[in-house]
């Protein structure tokens, strides 16, 4: 939904709501095209590539919220995410720097889509809250509570190491949004029957 | 009354060192990222960098970053920013503002009236 | 980084008349049905103020002969009805990524 607009329509919200996260949590839209550019593309480097445990919250956390209490903390996780991947951003390659080494300027352009989407998604979430009559959120073109912060990356020189920490995150993002799928895939037809 | 006032701005030489701070009133100040913008004498205006709510991501422009540092003190509802190896470029206006709207994709919407920099020999 | 190019740099408009800015970025900064484009209103001595968020939205206090419209690289701040309060420099913003760059300003004054 664009920014302030909310369907009423549980269902359609649902659908959006899952479309949203079958799309997220592709690889190919996001982890991929981080480790060209960033030159990891190398089985050995492949290897370092694995999520940090505890980063996200697991499946099995998730479906044992309810729904009100997932929707915050999915809110609350992708306003995280949001900022993890606006640091990502600050130290990608230049679009002149990648034409020059030959990389795909498609990849930058992939990972330049990421947040837009996912502020796209957290809009949704927020709307699927107000529906479910949860006044507990806060409104998406509004500052609100700070969300609560992720370990703060490593402060280090180290480059690879930098890379390797946003591959890492950027894992265990494809991971959650897998997930937050699974989750909403089980609710039912209407905002007050879930399936089990 | 939502306020922002910005101080420590003054005279210092090139390659010198400076610490702004802006105080923060009239509002939840650890709710808010927090940016700082600045102004050449008679030129626009251009953002230097920002701080998100908590305090554990920070945005810089290409030409300062590794040279100035923005910091807070939510206990203290007080921005910084310490700008080190200054040059004579430098030299502006430097405003405090509030960051609103979408998380990283903000804009400003409660200013400071400013503190002026000025970096010369 | 996104350029920001402001038109015209100078305008000269007859009060009670319309006035209009243009704002073009060197590359989108319009996603996911988002358009990441601001208005400020500088008057000297004083900081800037916001007149619209996000390419069309009213800044709460901000008269309504101010409107923003545009999506993608184009966007326009409208004055309906120059008051001589407006005569003053306008600059657009874009939040799309960092850096957030601004327009190099436009100079609105009395015909």
């Known amino acids: 939904a664009a920014m302030g607009s909310c369907s009423k329509e549980y269902r359609m919200l649902l659908g959006q709501l899952q479309k949203q996260t079958d799309l997220m949590q592709d690889t190919s839209r996001l982890l991929d095209p981080y480790i060209r550019i960033q030159g990891l593309d190398i089985p050995k480097l492949r290897e370092h590539c694995r999520e940090s445990p505890g980063a996200f919250p697991s499946e099995e956390t998730l479906r044992g919220l309810g729904r009100r209490g997932f929707l915050q903390t999915l809110n609350a996780t992708l306003g995280r995410v949001l900022h993890r991947l606006a640091d990502l951003e600050q130290h990608l390659p230049k679009a002149q720097d990648l034409e020059r080494s030959g990389l795909n300027i498609e990849d930058l352009e992939k990972l330049q889509m990421a947040r837009p989407n996912v502020l796209g998604l957290r809009n949704n979430v927020y709307c699927m809250a107000q529906l479910l009559d949860n006044s507990d959120m806060t409104e998406p073109t509004k500052a609100g509570r700070g969300t609560p912060q992720p370990p703060t990356p490593t402060p280090t020189s180290d480059v690879f190491q930098r890379k390797l920490e946003g591959c890492s995150f950027l894992r265990g993002y494809h991971r959650f949004m897998h997930s937050v799928g699974r989750v909403f895939s089980k609710w039912g037809e209407s905002p007050n029957r879930s399936r089990r | 009354e939502m306020q922002l006032v910005e101080s420590g701005g003054g005279l210092v030489q090139p390659g010198g060192s400076l610490r702004l701070s802006c105080a923060a009133s009239?509002?939840?100040?650890?709710?808010?990222?927090m940016s700082w913008v600045r102004q050449a004498p008679g030129k626009g205006l251009e953002w230097v960098a920002t701080?998100?709510?908590?305090?554990?991501?920070?945005y810089y422009l290409d030409n300062v970053r590794g040279r100035f540092t923005i910091s807070r003190d939510n206990a203290k509802n007080s921005l910084y920013l310490q700008m080190n190896s200054l040059r004579a470029e430098d030299t502006a206006v430097y405003y405090c503002?509030?960051?609103?709207?979408?998380?990283?994709?903000?804009?400003?919407?409660?200013w400071g009236r400013g503190t002026l920099v000025t970096v010369s020999s | 980084d996104i350029v920001m190019t402001q038109s015209p740099d100078s305008l000269a408009v007859s009060l009670g008349e319309r006035a209009t800015i243009n704002c073009r970025a060197s590359?989108?900064?319009?996603?996911?049905?988002?358009?990441?484009m601001h208005w400020y209103q500088q008057k000297p001595g004083q900081p800037p103020k916001v007149l619209i968020y996000?390419?069309?939205n009213l800044e709460s206090g901000v008269p309504d002969r101010f409107s923003g419209s545009g999506s993608g690289t184009d966007f326009t701040l409208t004055i309906s009805s120059l008051q001589a309060e407006d005569v003053v420099v306008y600059y657009c913003?874009?939040?799309?990524?960092?850096?957030?760059?601004f327009g190099g300003g436009t100079n609105v004054e009395i015909k």
């Open positions: 009239g509002f939840t100040f650890s709710n808010y990222a």
């Open positions: 590359k989108s900064v319009s996603a996911a049905g988002y358009n990441f």
């Open positions: 913003l874009h939040s799309r990524e960092f850096p957030f760059t």
């Open positions: 503002a509030r960051d609103v709207g979408h998380t990283t994709f903000w804009y400003f919407d409660v």
């Open positions: 996000y390419a069309s």
């Open positions: 701080i998100s709510d908590g305090g554990s991501f920070t």
